[in-house]
């Protein structure tokens, strides 16, 4: 995130409810911190289509968070 500035969230707005699994290149989870007080799920889309924030309350986001946490712990 080249433009990332301290003290602000990376996403604006509630985020998309779901992204087609076939379009996902990778998922990043940003946990609450000094920079942002909420969890953020950032999806990198395939074919250089940029990034999107997934609504952390959505079913898909919950599944991704669970998957990542299982992998990491």
């Amino acid at each position: 995130f080249p433009m990332f500035k301290r003290g602000r969230c990376l996403c604006i707005g509630p985020g998309v409810k779901a992204v087609k699994v076939a379009d996902i290149e990778k998922a990043s989870i940003m946990y609450p911190s000094n920079n942002c007080d909420k969890i953020e799920v950032i999806i990198t889309l395939k074919e250089n289509k940029g990034q999107r924030c997934l609504n952390p309350k959505s079913k898909q986001a919950r599944l991704i968070i669970k998957k990542v946490e299982r992998k990491n712990f």
Partner: nanobody
Framework: EVQLVESGGGLVQAGGSLRLSCAAS????????IGWFRQAPGKEREGVSI????????YYADSVKGRFTISSDNAKNTVYLQMNSLKPEDTAVYYC??????????????????????WGQGTQVTVSS
Amino acid sequence: EVQLVESGGGLVQAGGSLRLSCAASGFTFDDYAIGWFRQAPGKEREGVSIISSSDGSTYYADSVKGRFTISSDNAKNTVYLQMNSLKPEDTAVYYCAAGQGWVIATMTSFRAHREYDYWGQGTQVTVSS
């Protein structure tokens, strides 16, 4: 049917002001961030200012901070961009967009995605020196 209708563009002298309006319909306002983007001839479309109607959070490009103010009237499903101290380099077509999942870091070289974004037709802003 989703509609975003911009108004308020025009010709103004450097140092002057304009107020752009974006009237939205056909979707749930709170599910989207609403933003103003601009495209100058031969340049990429860039994010100018964005507001999330769900929590009121805002974003401003560095080039407009302190000069432009974004606000929304949720009852009217309308977003406003008050532009003060306009400069010739603000000359561009200004587009209103509604989007889901915008990542702030990507707003300077924005890639629209038809699945998640709706766009207005644009309004011309010309600032003469």
